[in-house]
């Protein structure tokens, strides 16, 4: 068997809402993956599991099942959404994200994704993780790759 390539492209959109009573931020983050099947037979993308971390704390998880079948030597782009919650124990983040004196409220999130593919009863898992900028202050649509956090070192939060 040849490889199945998974490429995390980036954040496609981030939609934000607030609970002022709980001082909590809700971010619905839609991500884009490219999955390439280099084989001469079809493979099934069985599931995608994803999680988002902020400052080493998991703030959101998602799982998609029975997603798609990728034909021989084909590539599919898949969007998946992770609902995240920055809760009251990170109260300072509510202040930052709702601060009107700051115009771009970028926070650095670690996106982790695992894609499980199957073919002829064989299962394979491919994982990726990437740091991304997300604006927690307003709804934002990104051009693919625009939200990339380029610092190779783990950011200090």
């Amino acid at each position: 068997p040849r490889s199945i390539d998974v490429k995390y492209i980036g954040v496609k959109s981030a939609y934000v809402s607030y609970d002022v009573q709980k001082r909590t931020i809700y971010l619905n983050i839609t991500n884009t993956l490219n999955i390439t099947n280099n084989n001469y037979y079809s493979v099934e993308v069985e599931n995608i599991t994803a999680q988002v971390q902020f400052s080493k704390t998991v703030i959101g998880k998602a799982r998609l099942n029975n997603i798609t079948i990728i034909g021989p030597l084909d590539m599919k782009q898949i969007d998946y959404t992770v609902p995240t919650v920055i809760a009251e124990e990170m109260s300072y983040m509510y202040d930052f994200c709702t601060l009107i004196s700051i115009k771009v409220h970028n926070i650095v999130l670690m996106m982790q994704v695992t894609v499980t593919t199957t073919y002829f009863g064989h299962s394979e898992q491919i994982s990726q993780e990437r740091y991304q900028y997300v604006d927690c202050g307003r709804n934002t649509t990104y051009q693919l790759g625009q939200s990339e956090y380029l610092n190779v070192l783990q950011p200090q939060q």
Partner: antibody, heavy 119, light 112 residues
Framework: EVQLVESGGDLVKPGGSLKLSCVAS????????MSWVRQTPDKRLEWVAT????????YYPDSVKGRLTVSRDNAKNTLYLQMSSLKSEDTAIYYC????????????WGQGTTLTVSS | DIVMTQAAFSNPVTLGTSASISCRSS???????????LYWYLQKPGQSPQLLIY???NLASGVPNRFSSSGSGTDFTLRISRVEAEDVGVYYC?????????FGGGTKLEIK
């Protein structure tokens, strides 16, 4: 209904001190940043202080830095402005205002309290 | 500091006709995120200021759609399509692109 009620305005001698208060009701006070804006006798508006919802971020213009201190007590739904080393140019109506993070500005203002600095 | 400039008085207008109030900033208020950080407030006689327009062209909640606003990065116009008696007061433009946030001197709407 959003309500902001300022109090504490008075006649003060130059060099004196005063503390203004603003009691908020009709909204979740702890979820909103707040500002103080003053209106001078010639009707000009001047922003003088901002405090974030949890008091993590505080901003002043250079003209009042070191003399004015903004604070808040979320348990009491109250915003404060402590003023010291007062000058005649601090004479104004002082308004407290709620910040709307969706609008990106102050959306509701109180009725104001008057400070007069004069000997 | 960003200086906001307004004429002290508008051209006198007749009730039911349209009025325009201008404001100019000393620096562009258009941010790289595409938002223009220009606001309009109305202070009616004996009252505190009330928000009319946020981020240059958006009507605040409860504001009649007789009000509209447009502009470039530095020149802005507030329009009232059919002036009513309750529109009388002083109109202030303001910016909060940069600290310190600053206001224009205000334009008093004059009725003929």
């Amino acid at each position: 209904e959003v309500q902001l009620v300022e109090s504490g305005g008075d006649l003060v001698k130059p060099g004196g001190s005063l503390k203004l208060s603003c009691v908020a009701s009709g909204f979740t006070f702890s979820g909103y940043g707040m500002s103080w804006v003053r209106q001078t006798p010639d009707k000009r508006l001047e922003w003088v202080a901002t405090i974030s919802s949890g008091s993590f971020y505080i901003y002043y213009p250079d003209s009042v830095k070191g003399r004015l201190t903004v604070s808040r007590d979320n348990a009491k739904n109250t915003l404060y402005l402590q003023m010291s080393s007062l000058k005649s140019e601090d004479t104004a109506i002082y308004y407290c205002a709620r910040q709307n993070f969706y609008y990106g500005c102050e959306d509701y203002w109180g009725q104001g309290t008057t400070l007069t600095v004069s000997s | 500091d960003i200086v906001m400039t307004q004429a002290a008085f508008s051209n006198p207008v007749t009730l039911g006709t349209s009025a325009s109030i201008s404001c100019r900033s000393s620096k562009s208020l258009l941010h790289s995120n595409g938002i223009t950080y220009l606001y309009w407030y109305l202070q009616k006689p004996g009252q505190s200021p009330q928000l009319l327009i946020y981020q240059m062209s958006n009507l605040a909640s409860g504001v009649p759609n007789r009000f509209s606003s447009s502009g470039s990065g530095t020149d802005f116009t507030l329009r009232i399509s059919r002036v009513e008696a309750e529109d009388v007061g002083v109109y202030y433009c303001a910016q909060n692109l940069e600290l310190p946030w600053t206001f224009g001197g205000g334009t008093k709407l004059e009725i003929k």
